[in-house]
């Protein structure tokens, strides 16, 4: 029977006994930076080319006995998970291995850097098809390792890494914290985050998605036909490297940004039990388990968006937090969140020729997060229209006035420490969907975009008194680009997008004893691209 | 994912202008920084990645490495250039005493220096 992990990543309609995945990643080369491997194991023979690259530290301990099967164990298993004949994800992918970890599974940042440089030079000498680099290793936060990963990613290489097995914030580790790398956490057969002894999978905003990483059957270096079960975020990363190889083989022209968006889009949503994560990390950690797309083509028409959280701003009065999109992505909206509720909103601003999302802390606040909604929108021309505080009783308004521009997101930012809490919320006049409405003492920022065939609409959902959270979702075929709260309440902690749902969090008045009757309204901006839909129909 | 996390140790070593007239002063207003792993047991002191500014050519990297060796030798320190980086990042990997960090940070083209550290199979 099919191992649980392969079943989990396989779309239901492909689970028949006869299913053979199309070409299985045959156009892609996967580089593995790990231990030595037993390349003639029956699972992977002929699939893995062992390069002559080796940069490893001496093993610790005077009595260390170098036993081949132990030295090869980690790398052989991962090669099997990526491309093994019977237990592999991308059965057609070819691999190249570089030895950067010694027989005890230990390496150095410098050895890994030299390995990444070796890959770049190989790519320049002999350009091949798409490249995936699997980094099933982690060390402490390293500026230089992250920088090298960024350079390699910008050269068109897809890097996939383990989030780390430290039951900790993945942002404290490298290469897991590198924004350009696809960082993978581990889940088990019950869709629980993986526990490993007293530790377990890392989590947090630096994790892109999770994948199977417990009791994963794969090639064992103990003998040439042996299999063994191993667990860890390395195994999870190997699944995503395999899925990436399959996707790139089907669509070799995919950019890193497109691939990441597809991995997120086709993931199983909201299946992970978040109670395992520390409470302050739950909102930051993506509830996504990787899966293969239901078919190899036809995803191109979709407007893909993802949510990117910033680092925490820190608690100082003027502290700010910045969330950035990847170079190929458009920032379509910007929101903010503070657990204490003390914040001064957010704004979209240009930085180095690109829009970023900046959130502002308030006096007495414990800090804020900026939340960017990052989308793939070809030929987009986006700009931010700002209205300063109106001081008028009706509140501040701003709309997209340029011909053909549609509203994709609304942000508001205020200098006063506490927006007037006694003011009733301002309701948007009907029939004017292309405008943002805000508190009279706030600056309002509208994200206005022009792109072929782009159409957007506003959806609202309000409840009479704050009850923890209000949500509003975009319907099938539409993608959430903007998420904000209608103004006028002191209870709102912030707004953020979770997949296609806009979540507005507020203090629960039932627990604070407040008698306020203020409504909290979640405002979602839902968009779709008729141009992308037409383009994909023409291809088929 | 941001690369601006403040949760790793950063030591900014101030430049002492009166020391070592041989070193070309870095461009005005820029200070090279030193980084090391926040997890002490994972640190590998004695080996350092010297990262040079983005547009530095291979020949300049090699020249900077040689200059470090020469200046270290004048102070009675042995150094060993283990690798010169080019292709991804300009720079070099050097085995040397931590006593030489202040000197190394003053070298021309230096962006930052990072102490080597361990990585582990996951």
């Amino acid at each position: 029977s099919i191992p649980w992990n392969l079943e989990r990543i396989t779309p239901p309609r492909y689970r028949a006994d006869e299913y053979q995945p199309p070409d299985g990643g045959s156009l892609v080369e996967v580089y593995l930076l790990d231990t030595s491997i037993q390349s003639d194991h029956r699972e992977i023979e002929g699939r893995v080319m062992v390069t002559d690259f080796e940069n490893v530290p001496e093993e610790d301990g005077t009595r260390f006995h170098r036993q081949a099967s132990k030295c090869d164990s980690h790398g052989t298993h991962l090669a099997g998970v990526v491309s093994g004949r019977d237990a592999g994800v991308a059965k057609g992918a070819s691999m190249r291995s570089l030895r950067v970890l010694n027989c005890q599974g230990k390496g150095t940042v410098s050895g890994t850097l030299i390995g990444l440089e070796f890959i770049r030079k190989s790519q320049l000498v002999q350009p091949v098809g798409p490249l995936v680099v699997l980094l099933p290793l982690a060390g402490g936060y390293s500026r230089v390792l992250n920088a090298a990963c960024q350079r390699l990613a910008r050269a068109g290489v897809v890097l996939v890494t383990a989030a780390g097995n430290f039951r900790d914030d993945a942002c404290l580790y490298s290469p897991a914290s590198a924004p350009e790398v696809i960082t993978v956490g581990a889940t088990n057969a019950q869709d629980q985050p993986v526990t490993l002894g007293t530790l377990g999978t890392n989590f947090g905003r630096c994790v892109d998605l999770f994948a199977p990483g417990e009791d994963i059957i794969g090639a064992s270096s103990y003998c040439s036909t042996c299999f063994v079960s191993q667990s860890g975020t390395s195994q999870a990363a190997a699944h995503v490297a395999g899925i990436a190889a399959m996707m790139l083989s089907a669509e070799p022209e995919l950019t890193l940004a497109e691939l990441r968006q597809r991995l997120i889009h086709f993931s199983a949503k909201d299946v992970i039990n978040e109670a395992w994560f520390p409470e302050d990390q739950r909102v930051l950690t993506p509830n996504l388990v990787a899966a293969l797309p239901p078919s190899t083509h036809g995803a191109g028409w979709q407007l893909f968006c993802r949510t990117v959280w910033s680092a925490h701003s820190g608690p100082t009065r003027m502290a700010t937090a910045i969330a950035r999109c990847a170079p190929d992505e458009e920032l379509l909206s910007c929101s903010s969140f503070s657990r204490s509720g003390k914040r001064r909103g957010e704004r979209m601003e240009a930085q180095g020729g690109k829009l970023v999302c900046r959130a502002h802390n308030a006096f007495g606040g414990e800090g804020v997060y900026a939340i960017a909604r990052c989308c793939l929108l070809p030929q987009a021309n986006c700009s931010v229209h700002t209205a300063p505080p109106a001081e008028a009783s009706m509140g501040t308004r701003v709309h997209c006035h340029q011909q053909g521009h549609v509203l994709t997101g609304c942000s508001s930012h205020w200098e006063v420490e506490d927006l007037g809490t006694h003011k009733p919320p301002v309701l948007r006049p009907r029939g004017q969907p292309n405008q943002c409405v805000g508190h009279r003492e706030a600056s309002i920022h509208a994200s206005c975009c022009h792109a072929p065939g782009l159409e957007c609409k506003v959806k609202e959902h309000g409840i009479p008194a704050p009850q923890g959270q209000v949500t509003v979702a975009c319907e099938e075929g539409w993608t959430l680009t903007g998420c904000s709260a209608l103004p006028g309440t002191s209870h709102v902690l912030g707004a953020y997008a979770v997949d296609n749902t806009c979540v507005v969090r507020s203090r629960d008045v039932s627990t604070t004893g407040s008698t306020s009757e203020e409504a909290v309204t979640a405002v979602a901006i839902c968009c779709r691209s008729r141009h992308l839909a037409q383009a994909s129909q023409e291809l088929q | 994912q941001e690369d601006e996390d403040g949760d790793y140790e950063e030591l900014v070593l101030a430049l002492r202008s009166e020391e070592d007239g041989l070193a070309e002063a870095p461009e005005h207003g820029t200070t090279a920084t030193f980084h090391r792993c926040a997890k002490d047991p994972w640190r590998l002191p004695g080996t350092y990645v010297v990262v040079l500014k983005e547009e530095t050519h291979l020949s300049q990297s090699e020249r900077t490495a040689r200059r470090l060796q020469a200046q270290a030798a004048r102070r009675g320190y042995l150094t060993k250039i283990l690798h010169v980086f080019h292709g991804l990042l300009p720079g070099f990997l050097v085995k040397m005493s931590g006593d030489l960090l202040e000197l190394a940070l003053k070298l021309p083209h230096v962006d930052y220096i990072e102490e080597d550290s361990s990585v582990f199979a996951q």
Partner: antibody
Framework: QIQLVQSGAEVKKPGASVKVSCKAS????????ISWVRQAPGQGLEWMGW????????NYAQKVQGRVTMTTDTSTSTVYMELRSLRSDDTAVYFC????????WGQGTTVTVSS | QSALTQPASVSGSPGQSITISCTGT?????????VSWYQQHPGKPPKLMIY???NRPSGISNRFSGSKSGNTASLTISGLQAEDEADYFC?????????FGGGTKLAVLR
């Protein structure tokens, strides 16, 4: 090109031993082991075992376990298969083939066991 | 006695299609993706025609195709040609070894 070249025919008496060689070329040897397969006259194919060029590990079929020894000489890229205590039913053509996938075959070595 | 069962012989006229079956158990054919098919002409070594159930090595005509359902694998040859007349063997992984079928003699009727 990828080639497996085997040694010449052998005639042996019952109880004797035979050692057949197989020289590999044209590919990365450590990416594949070598399988040995035999075929008795007019019969089907029988897998005898496998040896690793990477670490010398072996995997023998139960039927010949104890009588067969496979070895490698990495300096000459050659694999050897020795079969001891020969019997008349060991008369066959012995083939070496690349890996478990057996995608490339040697030309075969005829071993005749006869008193 | 071979572990995998194949028909002793099959025949077909030029241009026709034939299918050779290879039946095993869940411990071999049913349990692995690694079923191969070999063609052997008299006095020659076997030649790999299909690997991993349905893949063709480069240089092998697309008239040869493979499939698997449950514990039975099949080789189909379409547009039969005189040079297809040969013995055909299937093979599969088992947990620790390899196993072959007894072979099928294909006759192309003149």
């Amino acid at each position: 090109q990828i080639q497996l070249v085997q040694s010449g025919a052998e005639v042996k008496k019952p109880g004797a031993s035979v050692k057949v060689s197989c020289k590999a070329s044209g590919y990365t040897l450590t990416s594949y082991g070598i399988s040995w397969v035999r075929q008795a006259p007019g019969q089907g194919l029988e897998w005898m075992g496998w040896i690793s060029f990477y670490n010398g590990n072996t995997n023998y079929a139960q039927k010949v376990q104890g009588r067969v020894t496979m070895t490698t000489d990495t300096s000459t890229s050659t694999v050897y298969m020795e079969l001891r205590s020969l019997r008349s039913d060991d008369t066959a053509v012995y083939f070496c083939a690349r890996g478990y996938g057996m995608d490339v075959w040697g030309q075969g070595t005829t071993v005749t066991v006869s008193s | 006695q071979s572990a995998l069962t194949q028909p002793a012989s099959v025949s077909g006229s030029p241009g026709q299609s034939i299918t050779i079956s290879c039946t095993g158990t869940s411990s071999d054919v049913g349990g692995y993706n690694s079923v191969s098919w070999y063609q052997q002409h008299p006095g020659k070594p076997p030649k790999l025609m299909i690997y991993e159930v349905s893949n063709r090595p480069s240089g092998i005509s697309n008239r040869f195709s493979g499939s698997k359902s449950g514990n039975t694998a099949s080789l189909t040859i379409s547009g039969l040609q005189a040079e297809d007349e040969a013995d055909y063997f299937c093979s599969s992984y088992t947990s620790t070894s390899m196993v072959f079928g007894g072979g099928t003699k294909l006759a192309v009727l003149r």
